[in-house]
Amino acid sequence: EEELQVIQPDKSVSVAAGESAILHCTVTSLIPVGPIQWFRGAGPARELIYNQKEGHFPRVTTVSESTKRENMDFSISISNITPADAGTYYCVKFRKGSPDTEFKSGAGTELSVRAKPS
């Protein structure tokens, strides 16, 4: 079977302050099993935005119904965007393990924040 790919179709997204940003991500396979996580930025200082496995992320909702067993759409919506949210967001597939290990990352989506229209 073909190896899993993580697809972030949008190189960039621009959103007005106060609006919601939708960041798209799909995977091409459910194997290997393991959670999806979203990060802002790359490297050791990257910020966790959403973890499929656990955690409380009040501003983040999944766009599709993530509890579907065959779900391959891990797009998220981030509400009430502010200029502090600007950055590049990465959708990352982890492979199960102790601990889970990063398996494949999407290419990233750069979020820019426009001034709130007056």
Epitope: L30, V33, P35, E65, S66, T67, E70, K96
Partner: antibody, heavy 118, light 107 residues
Framework: DVQLVESGGGVVRPGESLRLSCAAS????????MSWVRQAPGKGLEWLAG????????YYIDSVKGRFTISRDNSKSSLYLRMNSLTAEDTAVYYC???????????WGLGTLVTVSS | ALTQPASVSANPGETVKITCSGG??????YAWYQQKSPGSAPVTVI????ERPSDIPSRFSGSASGSAATLIITGVRVEDEAVYFC???????????FGAGTTLTVL
Amino acid sequence: DVQLVESGGGVVRPGESLRLSCAASGFTFSSHAMSWVRQAPGKGLEWLAGISAGGSDTYYIDSVKGRFTISRDNSKSSLYLRMNSLTAEDTAVYYCARETWNHLFDYWGLGTLVTVSS
Amino acid sequence: ALTQPASVSANPGETVKITCSGGDYYSTYYAWYQQKSPGSAPVTVIHSDDERPSDIPSRFSGSASGSAATLIITGVRVEDEAVYFCGGYDGRTYINTFGAGTTLTVL
């Protein structure tokens, strides 16, 4: 505290139908996929059916497909299992279970006994 | 199908290991369910291979490697006597399966 309480079991004759209910409390029911699992007398556990959090997607073991129907009413925090054309082999304790993010089970109900006998 | 031993016995304080085989490591997540008497509600002691619910004692742990999962009870107690079912979820088939159960006797 998470609570799952099944009801609707009882004694029925072969060929008859029954609808089991599971009342959920102590968590956001509409955020979790749910399943039904049964245990025949002196036997092990057998997964029967699962349903996504929104109720749009259902999954069944082959042996009950077309005969059993899983459904849910999120406004009532309730899960259901409609069982048609019952046979003696369906005699079991029926449990509802809450699914984890990866479709295992973290909480179980106390079960309801279904006896199919002429 | 998942395969586990029919029975295991141990003295109080010993470490017990129960194995479960038959799943593909890359597509299967494992869990362990404790049932203290037939027909009573199962209790999840481990899910997601190695995650322990907050209300389960720390003497219960789990691991998975290759095609097998292991439940470890470190310092087993008399109250741990039960049947332990391994369960699996297969991401290829979308199906949940269970082993036949292992009866743990604490001597």
